[in-house]
């Protein structure tokens, strides 16, 4: 006999595109920078990739997800210092031997030109000019994102 | 010479308690369950702890943070099946040799009675009746949370 939670979760699977009325994020919170339909927060402190992911999560946001080369360039334009690295939400999946976004999708090989190795414990950082594979234990800055959404916005099914 | 991003981030450090007008989450999204001032989403699928953290993050939410024993009990009351385990946002920090919430705070030893070892690669799960230390690679369900906030809500400084 399924619990109400489990029934609900089954419903979710069958309702992936269903929308619901709830308050969307119409403006960026203070200190977040708007970039098109996103709000970005560039960290000031440093952390390994895992802690950066956790930090964005506790801010009810995500490590940056980059849709295409155009979004990459626009994000990089916000970085003023040549050498500073920022974690984004992309790391190497050993089991799938591929770069994987934290939302579960795989990197389209044309989107980003990654400098460095695709191997275990590798995570992706961006600088003003490039995209780098670094050890996930490296302590650098990171970028969190929140989607700017209209009032009608998507439900949140399981990944 | 500091970039505008860096200046902004410095401001954040100096404004930790400052609030800002922006749309808060006044009602829970569809399929999320309200528990007091939070919205909870109990996953239907299973994942290791890290992937669960990433999933909550991409939903612009956090793995569950439990304030006290009272909140634990109320959360456990929503779990109908005795045997099911759910990841929460607490894992073992090897460097600090302590249980650490993903928001950076340490576990108050009185809050949760953890069954199992406090050691490297250990993460915390909850069941209907207990709190367990499990290998973080274990694939179980997880619970995401979103805070229900009034319109005036906190800014998001670095952790």
């Amino acid at each position: 006999q399924k619990s109400s939670i489990e029934k609900c979760s089954v419903d979710i699977q069958q309702s992936r595109n269903k929308t619901t009325e709830r308050p969307g994020l119409l403006n960026c919170p203070i200190y977040w920078q708007q970039l098109r339909e996103k709000c970005l927060l560039f960290s000031h402190t440093v952390n390994p990739w895992n802690n950066s992911l956790a930090d964005c999560s506790t801010k009810e946001s995500s490590l940056l997800l980059i849709r295409d080369k155009d979004e990459l360039i626009h994000t990089q334009n916000l970085i003023r210092d040549k050498a500073i690295l920022f974690w984004i939400g992309l790391n190497f999946s050993l089991s799938e031997k591929n770069w994987k976004w934290i939302n579960g999708s795989f990197l389209n090989s044309n989107d980003l030109e990654i400098r460095g190795d695709a191997k275990e414990n590798s995570c992706i950082s961006i600088s003003q000019t490039s995209v780098y594979s670094e050890y996930c234990s490296t302590e650098i800055r990171w970028i969190c994102q929140k989607e700017l959404t209209p009032v009608r916005n998507k439900v949140y099914p399981d990944s | 010479q500091k970039s505008s991003i860096e200046k902004c981030s410095v401001d954040i450090q100096q404004s930790r308690n400052k609030t800002t007008e922006r749309p808060g989450l006044l009602n829970c999204p569809i399929y999320w369950q309200q528990l007091r001032e939070k919205c909870l989403l109990f996953s239907h699928t299973v994942n290791p702890w890290n992937n669960s953290l990433a999933d909550c993050s991409t939903k612009e939410s956090s793995l569950l943070l439990i304030r006290d024993k009272d909140e634990l009990i109320h959360t456990q009351n929503l779990i109908r099946d005795k045997a099911i385990l759910f990841w929460i946002g607490l894992n073992f920090s090897l460097s600090e040799k302590n249980w650490k919430w993903i928001n950076g705070s340490f576990l108050n030893s009185n809050d949760l009675e953890i069954r199992g070892d406090a050691k490297e690669n250990s993460c915390i799960s909850i069941s209907q009746t207990s709190v367990y230390s499990e290998y973080c690679s274990t694939e179980i369900r997880w619970i995401c949370q979103k805070e229900l906030t009034p319109v005036r809500n906190k800014v998001y400084p670095d952790s």
């Epitope: 440093v46 670094e134 050890y135 490296t138 302590e139 650098i140 | 460097s95």
Partner: antibody, heavy 122, light 108 residues
Framework: QVQLVESGGGLVKPGGSLRLSCAAS????????MSWIRQAPGKGLEWVSY????????AYADSVKGRFTISRDNSKNTLYLQMNSLRAEDTAVYYC???????????????WGRGTLVTVSS | DIQLTQSPSSVSASVGDRVTITCRAS??????LAWYQQKPGKAPKLLIY???GLQSGVPSRFSGSGSGTDFTLTISSLQPEDFATYYC??????????FGGGTKVEIK
């Protein structure tokens, strides 16, 4: 003001030990990768070791591996280098150096101490 | 380990001269290269990072260029305070972080 001050150098016999300290001030020490770099008299620069901001990641030059230990105490804003089994070829001025923030393990040394002289001789 | 070869090992120049120092890496290091200035009895000072980034407070007469294996430090108009030894350093993310052998800029 922003500065690094080394101490603990001196004369030591081969096989002996020394502990160098580097006191940091004027910046958020816990945000930076820190290194030790040495310079033998009249010679060039040699990187010795680094430690990450949290202390979780450490690396050494092959020439000191197994003999030197780097550590840090972020609560005291201090970097350390424990040097054991010292050899004549370890004689040098030892500099404590900060790397530019957030370049990760791509270390660029933007702040240096004045150095402390270590002499290994019988 | 990545070796860095600087040339020339020394150069004699006059105030106002344009001075160019080169640094060649034994393998490609992208743009992970820095240049330092060191005066006798003093600690080195960072001039250029990431091959061409001018460190804060460093005069604009200093510039860096190059990527891959070949890099250049240029002093466009040599000043009296520029007489010193210059070192290049590679900072790929895999230690050791090697320095070049140094180039001494002397008064002609």
């Amino acid at each position: 003001q922003v500065q690094l001050v080394e101490s603990g150098g001196g004369l030591v016999k081969p096989g002996g030990s020394l502990r160098l300290s580097c006191a940091a001030s004027g910046f958020t020490f816990s945000d930076y990768y820190m290194s030790w770099i040495r310079q033998a008299p009249g010679k060039g620069l040699e990187w010795v070791s680094y430690i990450s901001p949290s202390g979780a990641t450490i690396a050494y030059a092959d020439s000191v591996k197994g003999r030197f230990t780097i550590s840090r105490d972020n609560s005291k804003n201090t970097l350390y280098l424990q040097m054991n089994s010292l050899r004549a070829e370890d004689t040098a001025v030892y500099y404590c150096a900060r790397s530019l923030m957030a370049t990760g393990t791509h270390l660029y040394f933007d702040l240096w101490g004045r150095g402390t002289l270590v002499t290994v001789s019988s | 380990d990545i070796q860095l070869t600087q040339s020339p090992s020394s150069v004699s120049a006059s105030v106002g001269d344009r001075v160019t120092i080169t640094c060649r890496a034994s393998q490609g290091i992208s743009s992970w290269l820095a240049w330092y200035q060191q005066k006798p009895g003093k600690a080195p000072k960072l001039l250029i990072y990431a091959a061409s980034g001018l460190q804060s407070g460093v005069p604009s007469r200093f510039s860096g260029s190059g990527s891959g294996t070949d890099f250049t430090l240029t002093i466009s108009s040599l000043q009296p305070e520029d007489f010193a030894t210059y070192y290049c350093q590679q900072s790929t993310s895999f230690p050791p972080y090697t320095f070049g052998g140094g180039t001494k800029v002397e008064i002609k």
